[in-house]
């Protein structure tokens, strides 16, 4: 903590500007008045302070708003988000998508940090649920957000939301997030037609049911062979080969590669060897 | 690479003037700050005053209303104008440029910010 010093005669800052860079971490402490600073904020993030500069602009606000900041400060933090600990973000009431774009713009190329994943935790439960917008924002800055949510979480996410997911959002989601997402997805595309349908829906098929995969093998899909080793084992089991055959179309080929891979493997050894027999690929049960 | 050099200093009485330049060379931008600093035998060196890209100024207290920075940008020249000088200002004066993208160091009046160093001039004020 910055040591209480008298501001020096004259060097009282009149507005927070460039030449405080060359301010010692006393002067700021002495010289800068913490509600001036909250009002100017949007001017230190064009300022180059050092790290230990910001430290020390930190520690104003924290004693102007001992319960938190005001988000009209918060969405104006700039590089100074990157001194918050988490504790210090458990305070605040972040409710503007503009506040959470601003900051999570500061940590842009970055993991997602301790303190931008409390940042969310706040505003998603501030918000009550995963909006569209939110969503929008959270996987354009982190794609791999969705998969990093628990299947609680996930069942708080509305199917309107579930427009603003792109498949490769969705490249890290275990089976069990998938069985809460794909229920969501189904309904969200269900007024699609057939291959539009499919194309949507193909990325979040990992949750899907056998009566859901027998009612694609009708619809002349096309299955690729990576979308098809992504299922579920126990919706695949119960499929003929008649039904794997429709479901991949001219992908069928492809399961030969596979088959000393699940779900392939176990489905090969659960049909008639004269069935698989019709495929023509050699495949053993 | 940023080449900076300074000039103009010398021995003088005190109360008398004297103006340090301070040219510098290798960039188009200027830094994020240009600053004098002074060490005086036995001293550790501290910065007399600063002027930022954008043309702001600082000056240390002991030199407040005496120096003055002020820059050409032109001639790509940063100048010290030292009016009123004491004894105390007898130091060797130089010239410094930093731009620190990784903002590291206490802040911009700490030496160990600036990346850029002239060899220094001798400024001498007898009494």
């Known amino acids: 903590e910055v040591e209480k010093t008298a501001c020096p005669s004259g060097k009282k800052a009149p507005e927070i500007d460039e030449s405080l860079i060359f301010y010692k971490k006393w002067e700021l402490e002495a010289c800068v008045d913490a509600a001036l600073l909250a009002t100017q904020m949007d001017r230190v993030n064009a300022i180059p302070f050092t790290y230990e500069q910001l430290d020390v602009l930190k520690h104003k606000l924290d004693e102007l708003y001992p319960q938190g900041y005001p988000e009209s400060v918060i969405q104006h933090l700039g590089y100074l988000f990157l001194k918050m600990s988490p504790e210090d973000i458990r305070k605040w009431n972040v409710t503007s998508l503009e506040t959470l774009k601003a900051l999570l713009e500061v940590n842009k190329g970055h993991e997602m940090s301790p303190q931008v994943a409390t940042l969310i935790d706040r505003f998603v439960k501030g918000r009550g649920q995963l909006d569209k917008d939110t969503l929008d924002t959270l996987t354009a800055f982190y794609p791999g957000y969705l998969c990093s949510l628990s299947p609680e979480e996930l069942s708080s996410v509305p199917p309107s939301s579930i427009w603003a997911v792109r498949p490769q959002d969705l490249d890290t989601c275990d089976p069990r997030q998938l069985d809460v997402l794909y229920p969501k997805a189904r309904l969200a595309f269900q007024n699609m037609n057939g291959s539009e349908y499919f194309v949507k829906i193909q990325s979040f098929l990992g949750g899907a049911p056998t009566e859901d995969l027998k009612a694609l093998s009708q619809q002349n899909v096309s299955m690729d062979l990576a979308t098809f080793m992504k299922l579920r084992t126990d919706a695949v089991l119960p499929l003929t080969v008649a039904e794997v055959q429709k479901l991949l179309g001219p992908h069928v080929e492809g399961l030969k590669a596979e088959e000393r891979h699940r779900p392939v493997r176990d489905w090969i050894l659960r049909q008639r060897q004269d069935d698989l027999d019709t495929l023509g690929l050699g495949l053993q049960g | 690479e940023v080449q900076v050099v300074e000039s103009g200093g010398g021995l003088v009485q005190a109360g008398a003037s004297l103006r340090l330049s301070c040219a510098s060379s290798?960039?188009?931008?200027?830094?994020?700050?240009m600053a004098w600093f002074r060490q005086a035998p036995g001293k550790e060196r501290e910065l007399v005053a600063g002027l930022t890209w954008t043309g702001r100024t600082y000056y240390s207290d002991s030199v407040k209303g005496r120096f003055t920075i002020s820059r050409d940008n032109a001639k790509n020249t940063v100048y010290l104008q030292m009016d009123s000088l004491k004894f105390e200002d007898t130091a060797v004066y130089f010239c410094?440029?930093?731009?620190?993208?990784?903002?590291?160091?206490?802040?911009?009046?700490?030496?160990?910010?600036?990346?850029?160093w002239g060899q220094g001039t001798q400024v001498t004020v007898s009494s």
């Open positions: 410094a440029a930093g731009d620190n993208p990784d903002r590291r160091g206490s802040s911009w009046s700490s030496s160990s910010v600036y990346e850029y």
């Open positions: 290798g960039r188009t931008i200027s830094p994020i700050a």
